[in-house]
């Protein structure tokens, strides 16, 4: 007798590993024999699709080599014309051992930046990703995190982050390891020990010492008055990523010596500079032999201090006067950060105008020396405490700064404004003006032994200072 189809073994969820065989069984009782069709995600599976095998009159569907894209809902439908068609459905869950699809790569990164080591994985169940640094599991901290994607992110990379890394992907079916990659942390060149300034007698030997570090280890070059050092011997040693360079000189003239530490990061270079002056005791060339030319100031350090319209004297004893004089100011300027708020603007004015002297507007370019009275105002009024401390250190041989050698004039050698008012430069903003108390706060100490002329004052800080000797 005819009998409508009945599915006696409903489809069940099938778990299958990638590249393995998966079979769905749809046992049907009916008469006459039914026609059985199969669908995946409601799309008919064609009988001639070679990825499938349909046997036992359609009751067995076999996926011959499971791919991860085969997961979905599979249904069998049986129909023999007697009664309605019947259907049963079951899921295929493709299980997959962990696989690393985007492994980490070697990374070179500059200290302080963010590093990301990729590790993208596949797998079912979804693998958990962890990282190994060296031989130990990597512990996450405030700077280190494993992202949802599996990638390792390190904020503000430090030297100690350098090393060998690998990622590990794990699920219930297995574990996958990436190849070992290297994180190299590069560090900008930095000077650990700057060369010290010296005041020596003519014909003596001086050794300038400069120590720098960085990754890769920097190279050190020495510059004399803007040119590569032409004489003197250089000795270098490298230990624990620190380079130590000693320049021995036979001194026959004053000079500005710059230690330049350079290292390479890809196509770019990082540079650190430190300068020291070597002056000769009793060295004082006459003013008429000042050698140089006049130009608008184009630097940065003294921008707010120098008069906008004046030309400054650039000393051609330096190969590149603008750079050499700017470096001299820059080196001394940093030391002014620790002085009192009363002293600092006055000292900055003295420094800038002493190194970048105002040009005489006459026929031949010459620097205008600062008037003695204004130099003494800085020394005995605004910076009395600091100046005293500096002189004490100088006498005891403890002073390491450039300032006492080239960046601070000897007030006693400067001309007085009472001799010829046009022959020296003034610092009008050093005058404390009762009508304009913004310039400097009133003094609480006793009146200094300085004759400070009563000149108009303003709240800006443009001063002009210059020495009476040159470095040629």
């Amino acid at each position: 007798l005819p009998k409508a189809p009945v599915i006696t073994t409903p489809l069940e969820t099938v778990d299958a590993l990638v590249e393995e065989v998966a079979t769905f069984m749809c046992a049907v009782e009916s008469y006459p024999q039914p026609e059985i069709s199969w669908t995946r995600n409601k799309i008919l599976i064609k009988l001639f699709d070679t990825r499938y095998s349909i046997r036992e009159n359609g009751q067995l569907l076999t996926i011959l080599s499971v791919e991860d894209s085969d997961d979905g809902i599979y249904c069998c439908t049986a129909n023999n014309g007697v009664g309605g068609a019947v259907e049963s459905c079951g899921a295929l869950q493709v299980k997959m051992k962990p696989k690393i699809t985007r492994p980490p790569i070697n990374v070179k990164i500059i200290e302080g930046l963010k590093a990301v080591l990729p590790c993208t994985t596949m797998g079912n169940p979804k693998p958990s990703v962890s990282w190994i640094k060296g031989d130990s599991p990597l512990r996450e901290n405030s700077r280190t995190a494993v992202l949802e994607s599996g990638s390792l992110r390190i904020h503000n990379v430090q030297k100690e982050d350098a090393g060998q890394y690998r990622c590990v992907a794990k699920n219930s079916l297995g574990t996958a390891y990436s190849k070992v990659v290297k994180l190299e942390v590069e560090v900008f060149a930095r000077i650990l020990r700057a060369p010290e300034s010296h005041n020596v007698t003519f014909g003596s030997f001086v050794t300038l010492h400069c120590t720098a570090t960085g990754i890769p280890v920097p190279t050190i070059t020495w510059i004399e008055n803007g040119n590569a050092v032409s004489s003197g011997s250089i000795q270098e040693s490298v230990k624990d990523r620190v380079i130590d360079s000693r320049l021995q000189l036979f001194i026959t003239k004053p000079g500005l010596y710059t230690c330049i530490a350079t290292n390479k990061h890809g196509e770019k270079f990082s540079t650190a500079k430190a300068a020291a002056t070597v002056s000769i005791a009793e060295w004082s060339k006459p003013q008429k032999d000042n050698k140089g030319y006049c130009a608008q100031y184009r630097g940065e350090v003294c921008n707010a201090v120098l008069a906008k319209d004046a030309l400054v004297f650039l000393n051609t004893s330096y190969a590149d006067p603008e750079e050499a004089q700017e470096l001299l100011v820059h080196t001394a300027w940093n030391e002014l950060k620790v002085v009192s708020p009363l002293c600092r603007p006055a000292a900055e004015a003295l420094l800038c105008n002493h190194v970048f002297q105002e040009c005489s507007p006459g026929v031949v370019p010459t620097p205008i020396p600062i008037c003695r009275e204004y130099c003494l105002a800085v020394k005995e009024l605004f910076c009395a405490k600091e100046w005293l401390a500096m002189e004490e250190k100088t006498h005891r041989g403890l002073y390491r700064s450039e300032m006492h050698l080239l960046s601070v004039p000897e007030c006693s050698k400067l001309p007085s404004m009472h001799w010829d008012p046009t022959a020296c430069a003034r610092l009008p903003h050093l005058d404390y003006n009762k009508e304009n108390p913004k310039t400097f706060p009133p003094m609480t100490s006793s009146k200094p032994s300085v004759d400070i002329p009563n000149l108009p004052s303003s709240s800006s800080s443009s001063f002009s200072v210059s020495p009476t000797y040159s470095m040629t």
Epitope: K291, G292, C294, P361, G362, V363, V364, P365, T472
Partner: antibody, heavy 121, light 107 residues
Framework: QVQVQESGPGLVKPSQTLSLTCTVS??????????WSWIRQPPGKGLEWMGV???????YYSPSLKSRTSISRDTSKNQFSLHLSSVTPDDTAVYYC?????????????WGQGTQVTVSS | SYELTQSPSVSVALRRTAKITCGGD??????TQWYQQKPGQAPVLVIY???RRPSGIPERFSGSNSGNTATLTISGAQAEDEADYYC??????????FGGGTHLTVL
């Protein structure tokens, strides 16, 4: 761009005074950091500096010509002038006026095209 | 007076280096200028303050100055560099001095 141009007689008799004027355009002769010189060049010979007038009117003269040379200026016309007294045929030359600039170490960075002066009776 | 000594003539092969010297007592302590003068033309400043080039002057012109000699160097001389060259200094009394001039021939 500053321009300088000499003018004056091309022929001067011996023992007379040679007077030349230099007219400056594109810049003031009273501008700080500039000076204004007279330079001459006898035929087939080298350059000889004669004297200079500074932005403030002060003057300096070549030691060898000091007794015969005078440089003056007329700021309203932006001109400066050379006066050379008691000329002789040895003063025959091309006379140039030129600007000196502190920006180029007092070098002469602008020259006139020169004016030929012949001393002859 | 201050005397500046130049040799009257210097020859150089095309594209080779020419050196013109200017001798003076302790000239190294003074700013030295160099001028180029072609026939019938006014001089042109080519070097100031020993070694600085005004804008528009080719890089082949360079200068140096130390001791008693200042030097003008023309690296890779061109035919158009054939001219008279004069050195110039100011002394401490605000007097300007010129050298006698050197004629450069480019062969």
């Amino acid at each position: 761009q500053v321009q300088v141009q000499e003018s004056g007689p091309g022929l001067v008799k011996p023992s007379q005074t040679l007077s030349l004027t230099c007219t400056v355009s594109g810049g003031s002769i009273t501008a700080r950091y500039y000076s204004w010189s007279w330079i001459r060049q006898p035929p087939g010979k080298g350059l000889e500096w004669m004297g200079v007038i500074a932005y403030d009117g002060s003057t300096y003269y070549s030691p060898s010509l000091k007794s015969r040379t005078s440089i003056s200026r007329d700021t309203s016309k932006n001109q400066f002038s050379l006066h050379l007294s008691s000329v002789t045929p040895d003063d025959t030359a091309v006379y140039y006026c030129a600007r000196g600039s502190s920006r180029v170490a007092a070098a002469f960075d602008s020259w006139g095209q020169g004016t030929q002066v012949t001393v002859s009776s | 007076s201050y005397e500046l000594t130049q040799s009257p003539s210097v020859s150089v092969a095309l594209r080779r280096t020419a050196k013109i010297t200017c001798g003076g007592d302790n000239i190294g302590s003074k700013n030295t200028q160099w001028y180029q003068q072609k026939p019938g033309q006014a001089p042109v400043l080519v070097i100031y303050a020993d070694s600085r080039r005004p804008s528009g002057i080719p890089e082949r012109f360079s200068g140096s100055n130390s001791g008693n000699t200042a030097t003008l160097t023309i690296s890779g001389a061109q035919a158009e560099d054939e001219a008279d060259y004069y050195c110039h200094v100011w002394d401490s009394s605000t007097n300007a001095w010129f050298g006698g001039g050197t004629h450069l021939t480019v062969l």
